[in-house]
């Protein structure tokens, strides 16, 4: 844990936007917050008939849904868009749908990159 | 929390002006703090943040080189150095605590005007 | 980062349901406050991280969204909401305020 709001947690960076946005593609994001917030990685994603459509990765300001989560796990039954956060260096690495209704987890490995930092 | 910004005043368009920021009620040395104006009628505008060691510093574009902000921990306050002043920068400036401006400042008037 | 918001200018009554949006150029996560201005005074934070009620703001005022799209939401406007609103994205530099929402009296 740092000093003051420049505690740093790092994320794993993903727009699927990326050219209309004009940003990065992907890579690493440096998280920066205020002293008495916390901070999180998160994850969204789209699941058209069971292929899996990333459209964004990175930082997640204080929120409390978000506390003492090790591992990124969307909850909603069945959303247009998945969500999930959580707390820890790259913690969003790797995400999972496990609906709080029950139904089969699902969990996501990502393929294999080289990623580049943004700060 | 509080933040009393001083050093605003009327002067002419190419001139400097020293706005000052002192804050009490927390610890001063644990935070960024920020710099923040509104035109008259105007909507409000960032103008610049330090960080709580003085070791970044960023600004809107339009002062870029022109305004400078910097902080004396041991005496809680920021400062805004402000040269070559132009009509635009006519408005009030606020100090702001933190960079997500949780508490504000009451504000200081600067004027420029031949 | 480009903010814009949605009205610029509205007239409600007191009792009434208010929403305003502002949406950002790109995608800011949830790297978004919301201010409130009357006339005169200073402006107050209500809402930081998008959705987080600032310390001793009333439970009327929420705020939702994420990405691009944000609203500050008023659920029973009271006569000391009249104002004008303001968003600020603070994900990249230079930070910028939506244009701001003058909330009148109908």
């Known amino acids: 844990s740092g000093r003051g709001e420049a505690e740093t947690r790092e994320c794993i960076y993903y727009n699927a936007n990326w050219e209309l946005e004009r940003t990065n593609q992907s890579g690493l994001e440096r998280c920066e917050g205020e002293q008495d917030k916390r901070l999180h990685c998160y994850a969204s994603w789209r699941n058209s008939s069971g292929t899996i459509e990333l459209v964004k990765k990175g930082c997640w300001l204080d929120d409390f849904n978000c506390y003492d989560r090790q591992e990124c796990v969307a909850t909603e039954e069945n959303p247009q868009v998945y969500f999930c956060c959580c707390e820890g260096n790259f913690c969003n690495e790797r995400f999972t749908h496990l609906p709080e209704a029950g139904g089969p987890e699902v969990t996501y490995e990502p393929p294999p990159t080289a990623p580049t930092l943004l700060t | 929390v509080q933040l009393v910004e001083s050093g605003g005043g009327l002067v002419q368009p190419g001139r400097s002006l020293r706005l000052s920021c002192a804050a009490s009620g927390f610890t001063f040395d644990s935070y960024w703090m920020s710099w923040v104006r509104q035109a008259p009628g105007k909507g409000l505008e960032w103008v610049a943040n330090i960080k709580y060691d003085g070791s970044e510093k960023h600004y809107m574009d339009s002062v870029k080189g022109r305004f400078t902000i910097s902080r004396d921990n041991a005496k809680n306050s920021v400062y805004l150095q402000m040269n070559s002043l132009r009509a635009e920068d006519t408005a009030v400036y606020y100090c702001a605590k933190g960079a997500w401006l949780d508490y504000w400042g009451q504000g200081t008037q600067v004027t420029v005007s031949s | 980062i480009q903010m814009t918001q949605s009205p610029s200018a509205m007239s409600a009554s007191v009792g009434d349901r208010v929403t305003i949006t502002c949406r950002a150029s790109?995608?800011?996560?949830?790297?978004l406050a919301w201010f409130q201005q009357k006339p005169g005074k200073v402006p107050k934070r209500l809402i930081y991280?998008?959705?987080s009620l600032q310390s001793g703001v009333p439970s009327r005022f929420s705020g939702s969204g994420s990405g691009t799209g944000f609203t500050l939401t008023i659920t029973s406007l009271q006569p000391e909401d009249f104002a004008t609103y303001y968003c600020?994205?603070?994900?990249?530099?230079?930070?910028?305020f939506g244009q701001g929402t003058k909330l009148e009296i109908k």
């Open positions: 790109q995608g800011i996560s949830n790297y």
């Open positions: 600020l994205q603070h994900k990249s530099y230079p930070y910028t």
């Open positions: 991280a998008a959705s």
